[in-house]
Amino acid sequence: PEMAQPVDPAHNVSRLHRLPRDCQELFQVGERQSGLFEIQPQGSPPFLVNCKMTSDGGWTVIQRRHDGSVDFNRPWEAYKAGFGDPHGEFWLGLEKVHSITGDRNSRLAVQLRDWDGNAELLQFSVHLGGEDTAYSLQLTAPVAGQLGATTVPPSGLSVPFSTWDQDHDLRRDKNCAKSLSGGWWFGTCSHSNLNGQYFRSIPQQRQKLKKGIFWKTWRGRYYPLQATTMLIQPMAAEAAS
């Protein structure tokens, strides 16, 4: 389940006498190229991340799906550590994401694409807890994008991360990760799951359909999406020019 090492080396950052803490710090010291970088958040060993540099500073790509090349139906330890290929599909790893965000509120950007060429970009203000909270995700402000605040559980509600072998969802009667697929902040199973099974066509059986990648309030519950990207950026004072 370890993330593959990239073929090309990480960019050099000469203005820091240590590894950058995150993509935002890279941006702050003048890096304007997006791509693979080695970072070292406070108290964490170094690791590679995909950075996207924008007018709002540096973002860290934490998830990418687009072709079904990587199996996302994995246990807790895999979701904690990360898996996949940084050049392709991957999950960065909950512990790595938490080491980047620390105790800060963050902005989470979610890019969705369906099979008809439609796309949606959403932004959330979130707080990610540590492993002691099962990496609970809490919305701290309303949702951005055309979809309004109905895209996820209500603001203020904290939703733990769940996998088939560590059931932390908000349903007492079932294990969302088992009845759906992959690991996710499942809540009551029905809102979204961007780590579900990759389907190239819509399965006929509902039981299989439920296991796909979906975002209920965009294309509808259980519509299997073609591609997703998730990015995160800790909130601080805006990045220095």
């Epitope: 997006s34 996207k52 924008t54 007018s55 500073g57 890019q111 970009l121 951005a144 994008g145 990045a239």
Partner: antibody, heavy 118, light 107 residues
Framework: EVQLVDSGGGLVQPGRSLKLSCAAS????????MAWVRQIPTKGLEWVAS????????YYRDSVKGRFTISRDNAKNTQYLQMDSLRSEDTATYYC???????????WGQGVMVTVSS | DIQMTQSPSFLSASVGDRVTINCKAS??????LNWYQQKLGEAPKRLIY???TLQTGIPSRFSGSGSGTDYTLTISSLQPEDFATYFC?????????FGPGTTLELK
């Protein structure tokens, strides 16, 4: 529906000033970076300036640094480009563009012509 | 700065033709490449972003491909409304740079 409406262009003498405006609607303006891009017939499209979603950070191409100021008023859903000490080489069509960052410029205003000539 | 080159600069084609326009970056741009269409007197309109994602409302005859430094826009069957100028934009390096454009005209 996302809409960006540019205004404020015109004919101005070298060394004088002009202020462009871009009124945005159909999306949560305060969540998006914004930019100005200009088009010079002989040089094609070139980025001029960008501003972060909150307005705290601004970025400029070297040739306009110290002369142009990009700003925004999130309460009015409007971004601006204050152009001072204008030069003949600033003559162009100026477009306001929305910049989600992750996907590059997506929506553009209709553009305004700025002509710097004596 | 990343330099973008486009080929060809001019292209003459007929309705129904399949055409390809190429964009080359001076370094790897990690698939952060957009394509825009611009008609005379109008603002650029985004067709494709991040190499191959079709902008909502754009016909499926437009498609994009590529990786590293080389990218292609393909129009599978030219329609009368497709005669215009096409630009690429790299946004791997903030704030991005545009290609010089390809003018597609009726043969």
């Amino acid at each position: 529906e996302v809409q960006l409406v540019d205004s404020g262009g015109g004919l101005v003498q070298p060394g004088r000033s002009l202020k462009l405006s871009c009124a945005a609607s159909g999306f949560t303006f305060s969540n998006y970076g914004m930019a100005w891009v200009r088009q010079i017939p002989t040089k094609g499209l070139e980025w001029v300036a960008s501003i972060s979603s909150g307005g705290g950070n601004t970025y400029y191409r070297d040739s306009v640094k110290g002369r142009f100021t990009i700003s925004r008023d999130n309460a009015k859903n409007t971004q601006y480009l204050q152009m001072d000490s204008l030069r003949s080489e600033d003559t162009a069509t100026y477009y306001c563009a929305r910049d989600p960052g992750i996907t590059g410029f997506d929506y553009w205003g209709q553009g305004v012509m700025v002509t710097v000539s004596s | 700065d990343i330099q973008m080159t486009q080929s060809p600069s001019f292209l003459s084609a007929s309705v129904g033709d399949r055409v390809t326009i190429n964009c080359k970056a001076s370094q790897n741009i990690n698939k952060y490449l957009n394509w825009y269409q611009q008609k005379l007197g109008e603002a650029p309109k985004r067709l494709i972003y991040n190499t191959n994602t079709l902008q909502t409302g754009i016909p499926s005859r437009f498609s994009g491909s590529g990786s590293g430094t080389d990218y292609t826009l393909t129009i599978s069957s030219l329609q009368p409304e497709d005669f215009a100028t096409y630009f690429c934009l790299q946004h791997n390096s903030f704030p991005g740079t545009f290609g010089p454009g390809t003018t597609l005209e009726l043969k």
